[in-house]
C-alpha cells in the first residue's frame, strides 16, 4: 500500500545508519518529475537541511545543505540510473565521512558530510513520486 | 474533499473558456514547492503542451509550450501573488490572442497563443499541491 507524500518521519542518524526508500515516479521522464529527500535538523519542515537530495528524473541530481536558512554550494550530477516509469529502490548510507546513495543496488552518488549526521532529527520524502517503502535501519552496537 | 494529484481531465478549449483550480501548496515556500498546469494536445501525458504553467512558490513562474516533443522559448515572471501556506484560486481564461492567468482574482500573468487553444484535449494539474477544485467553463454559444 502507498505511504502519504510528502512523507515525514522522525529519525536519528549516525555512522552505519541506512535510509531505504522504494517508490515510482508519478510522470514520464519527458515531463521531468522530481523526487526529493531531505534530512532535517528539526521536526519542522522549515528547519535546516543536513542533506538535500533532489532528482529531476531523466535530467540530473542536485545535492546540497541548508544552514541557518541559507542554501550552500550545490553539487550536481548527470548520472541517471533511474528508469523511466520503473520502480526504484534508493538507499542512503551514512559512512564516516559522507553519505553514499545507492540506486537499485548500484552506488550512484556521494555527498561529504557538511553537518554532523547526528544533527538529523527528521527525514522527509516528497515531490512527484508514489512511495511504497520507507525504512531507517540502525547499526547494531 | 481532495482531488487526486496528478489530476488529469479531458477538456476542449476555445476563446471564452476558463479553467479554474483551487488548491494549496504542500510545503512552506522556503522549501520551494511547485505547481504545474499543462494543457496537452492528447490524452497522453507525453503529448505536446500548448500551455505549460509552472509555479515555483515564493520564487518565480515559468510558462512555455512543448511542440513536436521540444520545449520552446520559456517566459519567466518574478510576480508572486501566491501566499505562503494559503489556499489559492487560479483561473486561466482563453482570450482571443492569449491566456490570462488570474490568482485570487488578480490578473497576474499572460501568455500569447503559440498553438491554437482548440488543439487542447487534456489538462493536467500536478506537483506539490493539494487540489480541492478543478473546473472548465465553456462560453455559452
Amino acid at each position: 500500500s502507498l505511504l502519504p507524500v510528502p512523507y515525514t518521519e522522525a529519525a536519528s542518524l549516525s555512522t552505519g545508519s541506512t535510509v531505504t526508500i522504494k517508490g515510482r515516479p508519478l510522470a514520464c521522464f519527458l515531463n521531468e518529475p522530481y523526487l526529493q529527500v531531505d534530512f532535517h535538523t528539526e521536526m519542522k519542515e522549515e528547519s535546516d537541511i543536513v542533506f538535500h537530495f533532489q532528482v529531476c528524473f531523466g535530467r540530473r541530481v542536485v545535492m546540497n545543505s541548508r544552514e541557518y536558512g541559507a542554501w550552500k554550494q550545490q553539487v550536481e550530477s548527470k548520472n541517471m540510473p533511474f528508469q523511466d516509469g520503473q520502480e526504484f529502490e534508493l538507499s542512503i548510507s551514512v559512512l564516516p565521512d559522507k553519505y553514499q546513495v545507492m540506486v537499485n543496488g548500484q552506488s550512484s552518488y556521494t555527498f561529504d558530510h557538511r553537518i554532523k549526521p547526528e544533527a538529523v532529527k527528521m527525514v522527509q520524502v516528497w515531490r512527484d513520486i508514489s512511495l511504497t517503502k520507507f525504512n531507517v535501519s540502525y547499526l547494531k552496537r | 474533499s481532495l482531488l487526486p494529484v496528478p489530476y488529469t481531465e479531458a477538456a476542449s478549449l476555445s476563446t471564452g473558456s476558463t479553467v479554474t483550480i483551487k488548491g494549496r501548496p504542500l510545503a512552506c515556500f522556503l522549501n520551494e514547492p511547485y505547481l504545474q498546469v499543462d494543457f496537452h494536445t492528447e490524452m497522453k501525458e507525453e503529448s505536446d503542451i500548448v500551455f505549460h504553467f509552472q509555479v515555483c512558490f515564493g520564487r518565480r513562474v515559468v510558462m512555455n509550450s512543448r511542440e513536436y516533443g521540444a520545449w520552446k522559448q520559456q517566459v519567466e515572471s518574478k510576480n508572486m501573488p501566491f501566499q505562503d501556506g494559503q489556499e489559492f484560486e487560479l483561473s486561466i481564461s482563453v482570450l482571443p490572442d492569449k491566456y490570462q492567468v488570474m490568482v485570487n482574482g488578480q490578473s497576474s500573468y499572460t501568455f500569447d497563443h503559440r498553438i491554437k487553444p482548440e488543439a487542447v484535449k487534456m489538462v493536467q494539474v500536478w506537483r506539490d499541491i493539494s487540489l480541492t477544485k478543478f473546473n472548465v467553463s465553456y462560453l455559452k454559444r
Epitope: 535538523t41 558530510h113 554532523k116 | -
Partner: antibody, heavy 121, light 107 residues
Framework: QVQVQESGPGLVKPSQTLSLTCTVS??????????WSWIRQSPGKGLEWIGA???????YYSPSLKSRTSISRDTSNNQFTLQLSSVTPEDTAVYYC?????????????WGQGTQVTVSS | SSALTQPSAVSVSLGQTARITCQGG??????VSWYQQKPGQAPVLVIY???GRPSGIPERFSGSSSGDTATLTISGAQAEDEADYYC??????????FGGGTHLTVL
C-alpha cells in the same frame, strides 16, 4: 605522503599586494573532496583562516578578508596562490598553506612549515 | 576576535589530566578539531571530527563535544605536551574558524 611548501617574498610594502604560492607534492590539488587553505598567524596571536580553493576550483574566503583576497591555482604545476591586496602592517604574519580533506569545516591534516611575511616600508 | 573562545592558559601537574575547553561553536552541527603548536613550528592535528585521533598521536589525547562546548582532554600529561592548543570548527560548511588558543603548562 603529501607535502605542502609555501614560497614568496618575506617583505611587502604597505598598500601593495602580497602574493604567496603553495606547492603540493605527493597528491593532486584536483583530487576529489580536498580543499587547500591559507591560514595565517600574526605575532603572538592565534590562527586565522584566510580562504581556500576546492578540488573543483571553487574559492571560499573569510568574510573579514574577502574584499582583499584572491586564491587561484595552477593545476599543471600542482600549485595554488594567495593574493592579498592593499596590505597594512596588521597583515604581518606567518602564512601557512594546509590541506583540509572533506570540506572546509573539517580539519587540516597537512601543513607547510610557514613563511614569514612582514609588511613594512 | 575569535568566534571560538578558549582559556588563554591552563596548567597541569605532570601525569595529571588536563582539560582545555572551546566554547561558542555550534558543535551540534559542526565537527571540532584540535591542533598542537610548539614554538617555531607549524600546528599539528591531534584530534579531528570531535574525537578522532590521527595515527602517531598518543592515546592520552582525546576529544568530545556537546552543544556549544568542545573539550580536549590530555590524560596523564607529559612534559612534551607543553604547547599552544587551538580548536577549530565551522561557522558554516563554507567558513572555518579557530579558537584564540590555550597555552598548556606542564608543572
Amino acid at each position: 605522503q603529501v607535502q605542502v611548501q609555501e614560497s614568496g617574498p618575506g617583505l611587502v610594502k604597505p598598500s601593495q599586494t602580497l602574493s604567496l604560492t603553495c606547492t603540493v607534492s605527493g597528491g593532486s590539488i584536483t583530487t576529489n573532496y580536498f580543499y587547500w587553505s591559507w591560514i595565517r598567524q600574526s605575532p603572538g596571536k592565534g590562527l586565522e583562516w584566510i580562504g581556500a580553493i576546492a578540488y573543483s576550483g571553487r574559492t571560499y574566503y573569510s568574510p573579514s578578508l574577502k574584499s582583499r583576497t584572491s586564491i587561484s591555482r595552477d593545476t599543471s604545476n600542482n600549485q595554488f596562490t594567495l593574493q592579498l591586496s592593499s596590505v597594512t602592517p596588521e597583515d604581518t604574519a606567518v602564512y601557512y598553506c594546509a590541506r583540509g580533506p572533506k570540506g572546509l569545516a573539517s580539519y587540516y591534516d597537512y601543513w607547510g612549515q610557514g613563511t614569514q611575511v612582514t609588511v613594512s616600508s | 576576535s575569535s568566534a571560538l573562545t578558549q582559556p588563554s592558559a591552563v596548567s597541569v601537574s605532570l601525569g595529571q589530566t588536563a582539560r582545555i575547553t572551546c566554547q561558542g561553536g555550534n558543535f551540534g552541527y559542526y565537527y571540532v578539531s584540535w591542533y598542537q603548536q610548539k614554538p617555531g613550528q607549524a600546528p599539528v592535528l591531534v584530534i579531528y571530527r570531535d574525537s578522532g585521533r590521527p595515527s602517531g598521536i598518543p592515546e592520552r589525547f582525546s576529544g568530545s563535544s556537546s552543544g556549544d562546548t568542545a573539550t580536549l582532554t590530555i590524560s596523564g600529561a607529559q612534559a612534551e605536551d607543553e604547547a599552544d592548543y587551538y580548536c577549530q570548527s565551522g561557522s558554516s560548511s563554507d567558513n572555518t574558524v579557530f579558537g584564540g588558543g590555550t597555552h598548556l603548562t606542564v608543572l
